[in-house]
Interface confidence: medium
């Protein structure tokens, strides 16, 4: 099945084309007007990127966040924007690229040892970690080093990939996010901001692992645009 192929990174239902059937089989999904939802089991990954409407960060790729495209713009019109690199200004963690977090309005590296102690409060009780800092205004509550081992295992609740253990990323699964395995070579991956395909990925995949990039599978080059399959491939 798709699940086993994707090693727990299933996207069973990718968003339909604009105007296509919406709704997850056996469920009712609703949201802000104008946003369509996952329908059939079709891969709809296209290289021709277009702005991707969104209502919250989880709809966007791991290297994107959801915001108004213009400063002080209409809050009702939001799209997925490229994440902000190190030392760029930010307002919340999701704005910063993977491996970084928002500290004092600037994206800084989360590789430093003190990161987890700085932004976590009392964390070890449920699933994995429970943050108080999603709004990007972290409380400086330094914890002892014994807290650093609390990174979430596969299936743990998470808010950011830095919450998860090595080899895992934080990806959307229905209405929450959990730690899932980073994709390996040959596994199906997702290109975000599909042209004419606006919707929430309720099963979000992780990104490709180190040394890999998400590219069209070679034998799929001749396929029609709507069925091009992307896989994690060596650079």
């Amino acid at each position: 099945t798709l699940n086993s192929v994707l090693n727990s990174n299933a996207i069973k239902n990718l968003p339909p084309p604009l105007g296509g059937a919406a709704g997850h089989p056996g469920s009712a999904v609703s949201a802000a007007p104008g946003i369509l939802y996952p329908g059939g089991n079709k891969y709809q990954t296209i290289d021709n990127y277009q702005p991707y409407p969104c209502a919250e960060d989880e709809e966007c790729g791991t290297d994107e966040y959801c915001a108004s495209p213009t400063r002080g713009g209409d809050a009702g019109v939001q799209i997925c924007l490229a994440c902000r690199k190190r030392r760029k200004r930010c307002m919340r963690h999701a704005m910063c690229c993977p491996g970084n977090y928002c500290k004092n309005g600037i994206c800084v590296s989360s590789d430093q040892n003190h990161f987890r102690g700085e932004i976590e409060e009392t964390i070890t009780e449920s699933f994995g970690n429970d943050h108080s800092t999603l709004d990007g205004y972290s409380r400086r509550t330094t914890l002892s080093s014994k807290m650093y081992h609390t990174k979430g295992q596969e299936g743990s609740v998470c808010l950011r990939s830095s919450d998860c253990a090595s080899g895992l990323c934080c990806a959307r699964h229905f209405w929450s996010k959990i730690c899932k395995p980073v994709l390996k070579e040959g596994q199906v991956c997702t290109k975000h901001r599909r042209k004419g395909s606006h919707g929430l990925e309720i099963f979000q995949r992780c990104y490709c692992g180190e040394g890999l990039s998400c590219r069209i599978q070679k034998d799929h080059h001749q396929a029609s645009n709507s069925s091009r399959l992307h896989t994690c491939q060596r650079h």
Partner: antibody, heavy 114, light 107 residues
Framework: QVQLVESGGGLVQPGGSLRLSCAAS????????MSWVRQAPGKGLEWVSG????????YYADSVKGRFTISRDNSKNTLYLQMNSLRAEDTAVYYC???????WGQGTLVTVSS | DIQMTQSPSSLSASVGDRVTITCRAS??????LHWYQQKPGKAPKLLIY???NLQSGVPSRFSGSGSGTDFTLTISSLQPEDFAVYYC?????????FGQGTKVEIK
């Protein structure tokens, strides 16, 4: 610690309405998806509905679709379940739960009977 | 909908016994499976998440295994407080579904 407290249950006639509330504390409420799960007397567990952290996305079981509405007020750390057109088969203890049911409330009993 | 079938429906065991409960999904659910314990008049309590991860605060005598369609909850040495009903639940797809429950009674 994480705490979820349901309220609003009671006796209601078939066709009637009821609104359940779930007050959350001990965690950053807006960061977590939430669920409602019910358990009919002497029976097993049934997932009813789920909602994303921002409240933008809602999900329902077929048995309640079109009759129940899940919502949340993050400023009040409160989850809601508006239940309309109630039927006898909706009689159950209703639990609110965090995320994929890692923490549960104590439940509130809803009885639909004439 | 994905059907979750637990077996046995009930079992009688003694303190110190090793107890195994199985749960079968009607289709592949990867490792998106929880195990719960429920005592009379109480809310369910999460024991195992992601098929095999022990929830914080849960005694190590509880363990979970399996992936795909077949899963197992094992209690290595049954304690008096373990007599309860146990449920499996899949969160691979909506609607999320539970097994019918396994009642563990005192022999």
């Amino acid at each position: 610690q994480v705490q979820l407290v349901e309220s609003g249950g009671g006796l209601v006639q078939p066709g009637g309405s009821l609104r359940l509330s779930c007050a959350a504390s001990g965690f950053t409420f807006s960061s977590y998806g939430m669920s409602w799960v019910r358990q009919a007397p002497g029976k097993g567990l049934e997932w009813v509905s789920g909602i994303s952290g921002s409240g933008s996305y809602t999900y329902y079981a077929d048995s309640v679709k079109g009759r129940f509405t899940i919502s949340r007020d993050n400023s009040k750390n409160t989850l809601y379940l508006q239940m309309n057109s109630l039927r006898a088969e909706d009689t159950a203890v209703y639990y609110c739960a965090r995320h994929y049911m890692d923490h549960w409330g104590q439940g509130t009993l809803v009885t639909v009977s004439s | 909908d994905i059907q979750m079938t637990q077996s046995p429906s009930s079992l009688s065991a003694s303190v110190g016994d090793r107890v195994t409960i199985t749960c079968r999904a009607s289709q592949d659910i990867s490792n998106y499976l929880h195990w719960y314990q429920q005592k009379p008049g109480k809310a369910p309590k999460l024991l195992i998440y992601g098929a095999s991860n022990l929830q914080s605060g849960v005694p190590s005598r509880f363990s979970g295994s399996g992936s795909g369609t077949d899963f197992t909850l094992t209690i290595s040495s049954l304690q008096p407080e373990d007599f309860a009903v146990y449920y499996c639940q899949q969160y691979d797809s909506i609607p999320m579904t539970f097994g019918q429950g396994t009642k563990v009674e005192i022999k």
